[in-house]
Amino acid sequence: MMCLECASAAAGGAEEEEADAERRRRRRGAQRGAGGSGCCGARGAGGAGVSAAGDEVQTLSGSVRRAPTGPPGTPGTPGCAATAKGPGAQQPKPASLGRGRGAAAAILSLGNVLNYLDRYTVAGVLLDIQQHFGVKDRGAGLLQSVFICSFMVAAPIFGYLGDRFNRKVILSCGIFFWSAVTFSSSFIAQQYFWLLVLSRGLVGIGEASYSTIAPTIIGDLFTKNTRTLMLSVFYFAIPLGSGLGYITGSSVKQAAGDWHWALRVSPVLGMITGTLILILVPATKRGHADQLGDQLKARTSWLRDMKALIRNRSYVFSSLATSAVSFATGALGMWIPLYLHRAQVVQKTAETCNSPPCGAKDSLIFGAITCFTGFLGVVTGAGATRWCRLKTQRADPLVCAVGMLGSAIFICLIFVAAKSSIVGAYICIFVGETLLFSNWAITADILMYVVIPTRRATAVALQSFTSHLLGDAGSPYLIGFISDLIRQSTKDSPLWEFLSLGYALMLCPFVVVLGGMFFLATALFFVSDRARAEQQVNQLAMPPASVKV
């Protein structure tokens, strides 16, 4: 069923783009017939096109009526600069180019799978790493912190580079870099734990280049619902890669009889994927799918980009909402398996764990659920948004808000159900995570709508930085700290071990509700910010003298 939905969504997206092309051809014909006096049909940001009447914009998810910016044919009217030479004037692209774009998106998604596979392979063999290097829990925390911090610091740098230099070269170099570092780290001797820490930091830098730049290439290859679909596929790579990482880690370790080999799988695949990116991913111009390929000559400074992003309310609120998602997923991913194990101890269906790993079975089940709900969430979110776009222009942030608020309810119910039924708790986790993950691709799409193409990599980077800083960089530790604080004020018993962690985890649904509020705030400004982005893109398409970004 899901596969059918995906197929129909893909087909629908392709049909929609074909229809767009046909509409553009008709408009050009009408304009030529009218002696060229009408406003030209160039597409704006995310595919904005102006009808002959001048009051309807073909946006990414439908059409918006607007007041004309000037009488038809007025010099400087947005969209008129590229009547003859712009992509809008070109003949329809051959089918092979569509296939090429599909292949490029597939390779980029595969790269994202490997990004997360690599990250979670280490998580899958973390206990073996701890055992081998004699790493204490604080040392394991250091490995995680160094990775996230280096990722956070590197993301804005790659955002800057991604908006200014050849993106596929940066992508490939990033993959080659983290592949080489991960492969090398499998040979680190027992006494050099600090080298392992350094290697995780370097991998964080390599992976930041990918996570920051790859979505912007997809944004430049597709528009409208096709872009939503492709971003959905790209972001589905997160749970898929994470799940495969755990599986790869444990299965390779068992097959080879040595955990070191687990760290040698993703680098080999990474090198292949990096090469494929160089070969198959076209060197798209920023704004290419938005029909602005050759026109985006204007370059703004990084400082101006940052100011523009901070003033972009839809971007700011959606970034804060993403941080809330990150906070919850980080905390739940770390603590839920142990919480469920403690629940079973209280229910007398499991023994108190004195020798870690505690809740290994629960970790496995939770990992499988996360993998599946990631897929289901992305598909559901994309499908719901696609349907809601027919009803409202604010569909994207509203679907996200509903998903978040619904998720908060089910996350709350986890703690109610866990007291009496582990199966009930797993059902709540399933529904809660599906709803929580439904906004992954949509959030990326929101960013594509409200941020101009030449700023997208910086925007993705800043959002990534924010979501890690306010989200999963601190949430696992905060939950552990609160749990310990509660436990210190109560008597030492399995019941209070369970309850204290449960009470601490109750912070998650509150943060998720806050995230839902941020998405509702995004909905308030979404239409105006999107229109502003389209207008700015049209201004960027004009001669430099008239550019005001």
Epitope: Q131, H132, V135, K136, A189
Partner: antibody
Framework: EVQLVETGGGLVRPGSSLKLSCATS????????MSWVRQAPGKGLEWVAL??????????NYAESIKGRFTISRDDSKSRVYLQMNTLRDQDTATYYC????????????????WGQGVMVTVSS | DIVLTQSPPTLSVTPGESVSLSCRAS??????IHWYQQRSNESPRLLIK???QSIAGIPSRFSGSGSGTDFILSINRVESEDFSVYYC?????????FGPGTKLEVK
């Protein structure tokens, strides 16, 4: 100065129990991994058990030959490590050394940088 | 379990000579090998860690080398206090294991 002093050894009958104690001083005990190593008369060294610090959930590891019979534990407030030996056998006769693992805050070495003077345990009927 | 084999079991030398003691692992263990000296009626003491890293307070005549499966403890110009039993220990994986020892005696 690092000091490790073992007590609690003696002569016991097969099948009986004995608890060894190791008092420590001169270092931050709560952050340090501790082990017991034994040496049968005229034989080589054999690692018995390891207990990690509280930052590693006080995880314990045992040699296969004593698993299920011996239990290692620690009391951070007293800076002591213990070895509870149950169902003792003749082949458990040995000098038992309390050992310290070198600590590096984030991680620990599995080798033994300090050894106690040892305590003799004799299992005989 | 990783098995360590030490050779020779006994080595007879005269003071002032230089000697090499061998330790072989049943599988590759990188540099996770450590050397201990146990004098008669004394507790063991750590000489070398991680195959070649020296220990504070240990005379510089003791040195270690090797990687993978073959390791060497070298004593440059043996002194009278060096006549004792030498053990290698692996920490590559649990359980921690020791070699059977090499006894260094006066020729």
């Amino acid at each position: 100065e690092v000091q490790l002093v073992e007590t609690g050894g003696g002569l016991v009958r097969p099948g009986s129990s004995l608890k060894l104690s190791c008092a420590t001083s001169g270092f931050t005990f709560s952050d340090t991994w501790m082990s017991w190593v034994r040496q049968a008369p005229g034989k080589g060294l054999e690692w018995v058990a390891l207990i990690k610090d509280k930052n590693s959930n006080s995880e314990a590891n045992y040699a296969e030959s004593i698993k299920g019979r011996f239990t290692i534990s620690r009391d951070d407030s007293k800076s002591r490590v213990y070895l509870q030996m149950n169902t003792l056998r003749d082949q458990d006769t040995a000098t038992y050394y309390c050992t310290r693992h070198e600590d590096f805050y984030y991680y620990s070495g599995y080798y033994f940088d300090y050894w106690g003077q040892g305590v003799m345990v004799t299992v005989s009927s | 379990d990783i098995v360590l084999t030490q050779s020779p079991p006994t080595l007879s030398v005269t003071p002032g000579e230089s000697v090499s003691l061998s330790c072989r692992a049943s599988q590759g263990i990188s540099t996770s090998i450590h050397w201990y000296q146990q004098r008669s009626n004394e507790s063991p003491r750590l000489l070398i860690k991680y195959a070649s890293q020296s220990i504070a307070g240990i005379p510089s005549r003791f040195s270690g080398s090797g990687s993978g499966t073959d390791f060497i403890l070298s004593i440059n110009r043996v002194e009278s206090e060096d006549f004792s039993v030498y053990y290698c220990q692996q920490t590559y994986s649990l359980p921690l294991t020791f070699g059977p020892g090499t006894k260094l005696e006066v020729k």
